[in-house]
């Protein structure tokens, strides 16, 4: 179950309810735990996790990545710009999280939990954002054809793609977590 106002919170009235920032922080950490579990299965199943950074860098995927201009790093930090980047990035990751849904045998539920928790996280962050107009939503048609293309790859490429998505999503969330703690 994704984190939120769980039964422990309800049963202890003296405990302060989570602030918006705390809820977001908790949500990201929950998703990161899920990614760790999925990475464990991927690494046990194939030797993709030993792949060199060079090989992984030479990919055709356009996975969201934090850059200096996004204002999420300590130098040149910009709360507004950064929040837009985090939300936009998470929206772009959604198609890749959909791709992951049929990629796990023993961690099927975990993959679904990561996907659903990310949707909840996006909603939390959209409530926090002031400039929602600056957030571009990916085109559904483009996403549908991308998904078809990813699913058509040979098994080796699908294993590599799965590994790279998990690694990139983990890095993106870790950067987001650091940035959000400064807001």
């Amino acid at each position: 179950v994704p984190p939120g106002e769980d039964s422990k919170d309800v049963a202890a009235p003296h405990r302060q309810p989570l602030t918006s920032s705390e809820r977001i922080d908790k949500q990201i950490r929950y998703i990161l735990d899920g990614i760790s579990a999925l990475r464990k299965e991927t690494c046990n199943k194939s030797n993709m996790c030993e792949s060199s950074k060079e090989a992984l860098a030479e990919n055709n995927l356009n996975l969201p990545k934090m850059a200096e201009k996004d204002g999420c790093f300590q130098s040149g930090f910009n709360e507004e710009t950064c929040l837009v980047k985090i939300i936009t990035g998470l929206l772009e990751f959604e198609v890749y999280l959909e791709y992951l849904q049929n990629r796990f045998e023993s961690s099927e539920e975990q993959a679904r939990a990561v996907q659903m928790s990310t949707k909840v996280l996006i909603q939390f962050l959209q409530k926090k954002a002031k400039n929602l107009d600056a957030i571009t939503t990916p085109d559904p048609t483009t996403n549908a054809s991308l998904l078809t293309k990813l699913q058509a790859q040979n098994q080796w490429l699908q294993d590599m793609t799965t590994h790279l998505i998990l690694r990139s999503f983990k890095e993106f969330l870790q950067s987001s977590l650091r940035a959000l703690r400064q807001m």
Epitope: S51, A55, E58, N59, K149, N154, Q155, W156, M160
Partner: antibody
């Protein structure tokens, strides 16, 4: 050594169905995908589909989705292709071939010549 | 589907000379630093035989006179020096994504 054994020929009447076999030996059957390829006389090669013997997962060429069904019998290390509603266009040599996860077909059967004729 | 265009359709080469067959893909067949192009040789009445995989790697037991090169969308198979036994049909194939597709084939003969 790796071997993929296929019957040499099959003669079938139009409208009928046929199930062609490919018996694998000399390697762990469930560790490699099995592919099926069609070749009409004097023509090129056409990929029909592949099956993962470990879990039965299949991928088909859209052109053959309503024509071919791929299955495996793990106990006898045999792959099958069932072809339905046969017409003269289905007369061809059908090859089975094993591949690694990169879909590189390194070993091939000798092929089964299917003749559809009344 | 990825379309592979092979050229020439037929080729006659003198013994000891070089034979070059080209294969062009309708889109990139590479990812993660690997080009998913394979080359096969087929003689009459026989199944195809793997010569080259992943664009430039020799199949097991394949003579050194067969070599492959290329990346992205353009690939080639080189045979040098040409021998009598090399008379056959040659096919390129992409194994990047389903449906895995083959080129139309090149008929190689001795001049």
């Amino acid at each position: 050594q790796v071997q993929l054994q296929q019957p040499g020929a099959e003669l079938v009447k139009p409208g009928a169905s046929v199930k062609l076999s490919c018996k694998a030996s000399g390697y762990i059957f469930t560790s490699y995908w099995m592919h099926w390829v069609k070749q009409r006389p004097g023509q090129g090669l056409e990929w029909i589909g592949e099956i993962n013997p470990s879990n039965g997962r299949t991928n088909y060429n859209e052109r053959f989705k309503s024509k071919a069904t791929l299955t495996v019998d793990k106990s006898s290390s045999t792959a099958y292709i069932q072809l339905s509603s046969l017409t003269s266009d289905d007369s061809a040599v059908y090859y089975c071939s094993r591949s690694d996860t990169k879909a590189t077909c390194d070993y091939w059967g000798q092929g089964t010549t299917l003749t559809v004729s009344s | 589907d990825i379309v592979l265009t092979q050229s020439p359709a037929s080729l006659a080469v003198s013994l000891g000379q070089r034979a070059t067959i080209s294969c062009r893909a309708s889109e990139s067949v590479g990812n993660f630093g690997i080009s998913f192009v394979n080359w096969f040789q087929q003689k009459p009445g026989q199944p195809p035989k793997l010569l080259i995989y992943a664009a430039s790697n020799q199949g097991s037991g394949v003579p050194a006179r067969f070599s492959g090169s290329g990346s992205g969308t353009d690939f080639s198979l080189n045979i040098h020096p040409m021998e009598e036994d090399d008379t056959a049909m040659y096919f390129c194939q992409q194994s990047k994504e389903v449906p895995y597709t083959f080129g139309g084939g090149t008929k190689l003969e001795i001049k």
